[in-house]
């Protein structure tokens, strides 16, 4: 069910990411380094366990989860959050919650691309990945 996402993906474009990070509350120094990073995203599936690994000069992170089951995550920008990821209309929809706040990260296939939409309040960032 997540097979369309499996593989290694490289970031090819990023729109409004700094404004999104500002809205999340990420500090200037972290925004600067995170904004310069060009991460590779490696997605794998083993039974009902999905793993998403991000690798960049900024930070390497990895989450392993089962759909619909909440888990603890330390984000690349160093937030400690509670996350839950579900499959909705073919998209992987992640909700992160921390300090009474929440943000939604939607990963979806669009042709041969993987599009990641990050939403915090009224601010949306779109980041596009292609197969590496």
């Amino acid at each position: 069910m997540c097979d369309a996402f499996v593989g290694t993906w490289k970031l090819v474009s990023s729109e409004n990411f700094d404004d999104y990070m500002k809205e999340v509350g990420v500090g200037f120094a972290t925004r600067k380094v995170a904004g310069m990073a060009k991460p590779n995203m490696i997605i794998s599936v083993n039974g009902d366990l999905v793993t998403i690994r991000s690798e960049s000069t900024f930070k390497n992170t990895e989450i392993s989860f089962k759909l619909g089951v909440e888990f603890d995550e330390i984000t690349a920008d160093d937030r400690k959050v509670k996350s839950i990821i579900t499959l909705d209309g073919g998209a992987l929809v992640q909700v992160q919650k921390w300090d009474g706040k929440s943000t939604t990260i939607k990963r979806k296939r669009d042709g041969d691309k993987l599009v990641v939409e990050c939403v915090m309040k009224g601010v949306t960032s779109t980041r596009v990945y292609e197969r590496a």
């Epitope: 990420v26 500090g27 380094v33 920008d77 160093d78």
Partner: antibody, heavy 119, light 108 residues
Framework: QVQLQQPGAELVKPGASVKLSCKAS????????ITWVKQRPGQGLEWIGD????????TNNEKFKSKATLTVDTSSSTAYMQLSSLTSEDSAVYYC????????????WGQGTTLTVSS | EVVLTQSPALMAASPGEKVTITCSVS???????LHWYQQKSETSPKPWIY???NLASGVPVRFSGSGSGTSYSLTISSMEAEDAATYYC?????????FGAGTKLELK
């Protein structure tokens, strides 16, 4: 445990340069930026700049751009700040501190190096 | 540059007294990026409160922080002798990183 070790004192002559060191231990050096802060006697804290050891990327306070050069040696987990064309105005305590991401605050500080510029 | 104005610059409090130090910010910042440090003479600053309201490791629970936008404060519910120190606020929501000038808190 996280530690940032700095030499206690440096004495240099006006017009000379000095390279201050900050040796990190107890964590993965490349995971956190290192910031440098100046404090003149009886005064407040002044941000000089920061460096991300993983990428070597620096962010400098404009006021110190021609004064301070920040570098790292990842093999020894050490951050350096070179101060050039020293004058008495540069006499101060210089702290290095580790940046905690997201919030961008300094969660661990070195003991500080007292720099005295005098002939 | 975002200017942080601390008040008062100097104050004295008796043991058991409630103390409030304020940090006024010249333009609105994210509450995640406003922090407080404690410094005692001849020692390096210590992280005290981060992200407006989170106590750093080892900080007594009599300390608290609050605020949003352009107005922030550090409060001690009941002053103790060991709280005598200088407190600095700091922001890094916007470049460049800036500190307040400090509030020196003395024991009366």
């Amino acid at each position: 445990q996280v530690q940032l070790q700095q030499p206690g004192a440096e004495l240099v002559k006006p017009g000379a340069s000095v390279k201050l060191s900050c040796k990190a231990s107890g964590y993965t050096f490349t995971s956190n930026a290192i910031t440098w802060v100046k404090q003149r006697p009886g005064q407040g804290l002044e941000w000089i700049g920061d460096i991300s050891p993983g990428s070597g990327s620096t962010t400098n306070n404009e006021k110190f751009k021609s004064k301070a050069t920040l570098t790292v040696d990842t093999s020894s987990s050490t951050a350096y700040m070179q101060l050039s064309s020293l004058t008495s105005e540069d006499s101060a305590v210089y702290y290095c501190a580790r940046l905690r991401g997201f919030y961008d605050y300094f969660d661990f500080w070195g003991q500080g190096t007292t720099l005295t510029v005098s002939s | 540059e975002v200017v942080l104005t601390q008040s008062p610059a100097l104050m004295a409090a008796s043991p058991g007294e409630k103390v409030t130090i304020t940090c006024s910010v010249s333009s609105s910042i994210s509450s995640s990026n406003l922090h407080w440090y404690q410094q005692k003479s001849e020692t390096s600053p210590k992280p005290w409160i981060y992200g407006t309201s989170n106590l750093a490791s080892g900080v007594p629970v009599r300390f608290s922080g609050s605020g949003s936008g352009t107005s922030y404060s550090l409060t001690i519910s009941s002053m103790e002798a060991e709280d005598a120190a200088t407190y600095y606020c700091q922001q890094w929501s916007h470049y460049p990183l800036t500190f307040g000038a400090g509030t020196k808190l003395e024991l009366k």
